[in-house]
């Protein structure tokens, strides 16, 4: 399956926090989305291949890495002034 953690996260002002996303589905592509209250999903970053990733529609204030096929952590940086949202990780073949 695909596992995202933590379930809830509180960030102090000026802090970077990292959300974990791990999958054992042998999927090449992985995605991070953000959903604000009453809105649809918006793509932050996606990766189709190890070590490579592309910006989505709202990449500002976020960073990612894809060091292994199974893992695609998302860092919400201190530059992200409005981080409060629901974050969703996904993967596909």
């Amino acid at each position: 399956g695909i596992t995202q953690s933590p379930k809830y996260l509180f960030r102090k002002e000026g802090q970077n926090v990292t959300l974990s996303c791990e999958q054992n589905l042998n999927h090449d592509a992985m995605y991070w989305y953000r959903q604000d209250p009453g809105q649809g999903l918006r793509l932050i970053y996606y990766s189709q291949i190890v070590n490579d990733f592309q910006k989505g529609d709202i990449a500002e204030g976020y960073s990612v890495s894809r060091e292994k096929k199974e893992s695609f952590p998302l860092t919400v940086t201190s530059a992200q002034k409005n981080p409060t949202a629901f974050y969703l990780c996904a993967s596909s073949i």
Epitope: Q48, I49, V50, K69
Partner: antibody
Framework: EVQLQESGPDLKKPGETVKISCKAS????????MNWVKQAPGKGLKWMGY????????TYADDFKGRFAFSLETSANTAYLQINNLRNDDTATYFC???????????WGQGTSVTVSS | DIVMTQSPLSLPVSLGDQASISCRSS???????????LEWYLQKPGQSPELLIY???NRFSGVPDRFSGSGSGTDFTLKISRVEAEDLGVYYC?????????FGGGTKLEIK
């Protein structure tokens, strides 16, 4: 066992075209990108660029924009380097190298020697 | 482009000695995710390069523990604690943090 098998040595004349192949085995080809590295005789290593084996998108270092083209044949697990309008200073050994976990080139082909001479 | 400068150019050693190779980048190679993608490769005579160290200090599988990498920011070092005959060749540092990725000029480890 991961292996990258490159095509054999080639002798070309200036102005001709060469196409080098790099056949991957022992892993899922589209999971890891492929780098190409040039080594002129008696010289150091020079990174030429990178091929995303999932999307087919290539990234080239400035010195290798124009006459150089990376391509792939996913069904054959093979990456290619084509050099057009060959010049004498293209004489070199060309290596393919997998862009493995943690951003490192973890497996390398044996190298293909290209000699350009009139 | 980021320039990687290695020193020394040539390093004569006796078998069993410690060897140290320096690599300096023209600017920081810390990526936005906080990681530093600095590798060390060894090219033995007549062979393809092989990966020794990734992300500054991590040994690749099968690499003996006499090899160690260290450093941060712009200054990096590869140390070989006890040089063996099979260690001879040209060592290259390489940064893959930023495009274009770049190699150092190489350091030739040879017998004194």
């Amino acid at each position: 066992e991961v292996q990258l098998q490159e095509s054999g040595p080639d002798l070309k004349k200036p102005g001709e075209t060469v196409k080098i192949s790099c056949k991957a085995s022992g892993y899922t080809f589209t999971t890891y990108g492929m780098n190409w590295v040039k080594q002129a005789p008696g010289k150091g290593l020079k990174w030429m660029g990178y091929l995303n084996t999932y999307s087919g998108v290539s990234t080239y270092a400035d010195d290798f924009k124009g006459r150089f083209a990376f391509s792939l044949e996913t069904s054959a697990n093979t990456a290619y380097l084509q050099i057009n309008n060959l010049r004498n200073d293209d004489t070199a050994t060309y290596f393919c190298a997998r862009w493995g976990n943690y951003g490192a080139m973890d497996y390398w082909g044996q190298g293909t020697s290209v000699t350009v001479s009139s | 482009d980021i320039v990687m400068t290695q020193s020394p150019l040539s390093l004569p050693v006796s078998l069993g000695d410690q060897a140290s190779i320096s690599c300096r980048s023209s600017q920081s190679i810390v990526r936005s995710n906080g990681f530093t993608y600095l590798e060390w490769y060894l090219q033995k005579p007549g062979q393809s390069p092989e990966l020794l160290i990734y992300k500054v200090s991590n040994r690749f599988s099968g690499v003996p523990d006499r090899f160690s990498g260290s450093g941060s920011g712009t200054d990096f070092t590869l140390k070989i604690s006890r040089v063996e005959a099979e260690d001879l060749g040209v060592y290259y540092c390489f940064q893959s943090s930023h495009v274009p990725r770049t190699f150092g000029g190489g350091t030739k480890l040879e017998i004194k």
